[in-house]
Interface confidence: low
């Protein structure tokens, strides 16, 4: 067990703070909830503290919860590939570029670390080149979320990892909006981290609303499990 992994044996409170600017539309989001890495479970509620969110909530899911991949359930035989927990409590910087097909892109930078007993994900998001009447700024996405695989590889040069995956957002007209994610994680501290063999995270997310919440918000339930490395066959992935 890595030193960081010991911090995730129970339920951990989570705080998410995002400041965003998409095509000049500025907004802030605060999120609170908890994570249980034993089950790879996240429960979070996000509120736009600046009024109405200028982009659809589903476009921010990866930035919020795929940001705290330290809550992913790594089976016993894969624990030596869990970079995310090994970087704790000092945490990691997570940077992403998200390309929305035939539309604009988000660039995000986050610091994910423990502040006291709470796992905090502080994010800045800058979005440019979006069409005002496109699927994103035109709010044409359905309020739901598909399952995805998130592919992880070691980045030995930077003592971190590189991650990429493609999100499929459902559009109201029945088509799909693709969002290509390119991600890089680097540890904040100087301590040793686990550099993984190639593997993936399998994610399932459910979006809902709080009937008592008047503000623009999103309620998220998510399960994430690591996979792709079989018992005693690590040499196949080297």
């Amino acid at each position: 067990m890595s030193k960081g992994e010991e911090l995730f044996t129970g339920v951990v409170p989570i705080l998410v703070e995002l400041d965003g600017d998409v095509n000049g539309h500025k907004f802030s989001v605060s999120g609170e909830g908890e994570g249980d890495a034993t089950y790879g479970k996240l429960t979070l509620k996000f509120i736009c503290t600046t009024g109405k969110l200028p982009v659809p909530w589903p476009t921010l899911v990866t930035t919020f919860s795929y940001g705290v991949q330290c809550f992913s359930r790594y089976p016993d035989h894969m624990k030596q590939h869990d970079f995310f927990k090994s970087a704790m409590p000092e945490g990691y910087v997570q940077e992403r570029t998200i390309f929305f097909k035939d539309d604009g892109n988000y660039k995000t930078r986050a610091e994910v670390k423990f502040e006291g007993d709470t796992l905090v994900n502080r994010i800045e998001l800058k979005g440019i080149d979006f069409k005002e009447d496109g699927n994103i700024l035109g709010h044409k996405l359905e309020y739901n979320y598909n399952s995805h695989n998130v592919y992880i590889m070691a980045d030995k040069q930077k003592n971190g990892i590189k991650v990429n995956f493609k999100i499929r957002h459902n559009i109201e007209d029945g088509s799909v909006q693709l969002a290509d994610h390119y991600q890089q994680n680097t540890p904040i501290g100087d301590g040793p981290v686990l550099l993984p063999d190639n593997h993936y995270l399998s994610t399932q997310s459910a979006l809902s609303k709080d009937p008592n919440e008047k503000r623009d918000h999103m309620v998220l339930l998510e399960f994430v499990t690591a996979a792709g490395i079989t018992h005693g066959m690590d040499e196949l992935y080297k």
Partner: nanobody, 121 residues
């Protein structure tokens, strides 16, 4: 803005930014600086709501940002000034909470006219 001027290396200056038509007790107030021909660089910011402060690495321990809500004014106390601090200093305001690191100038909605600070060796 006011309080700029010329000073010897190692000296101090205090910049003031009195906001009119904008309430400093909400959102974020920041100081930026710009050398002609270069991008504006974030120096310090203060979250008006809770007083949380943020500093660029180059000024940590030397500069202090503070606010006086009653006077609707934000200050930048600059100690141990170095020739590299020579620049035009701008005060900026955003109706949103401060980003946790000093993000690009596009974050801010309101800007002052700028005040020149010159530090000679």
């Amino acid at each position: 803005e006011s309080g700029g001027g010329s000073v010897q290396a190692g000296g101090s200056l205090r910049l003031s930014c009195a906001a009119s038509g904008y309430t400093v007790s909400r959102g974020c107030m920041a100081w930026f600086r710009q050398v002609p021909g270069k991008e504006r660089e974030g120096v310090a910011a203060i979250n008006s709501g809770d007083g949380t402060t943020y500093y660029a690495d180059s000024v940590k321990g030397r500069f202090t940002i503070s606010q006086d809500n009653a006077k609707n004014t934000v200050y930048l106390q600059m100690n141990s000034l170095e020739p590299e601090d020579t620049s035009i200093y701008y005060c900026a305001a955003s109706r949103l909470r401060c980003p946790w690191n000093l993000v690009s100038a596009s974050w801010y909605d309101f800007w002052g006219q700028g005040t020149q600070v010159t530090v000679s060796s």
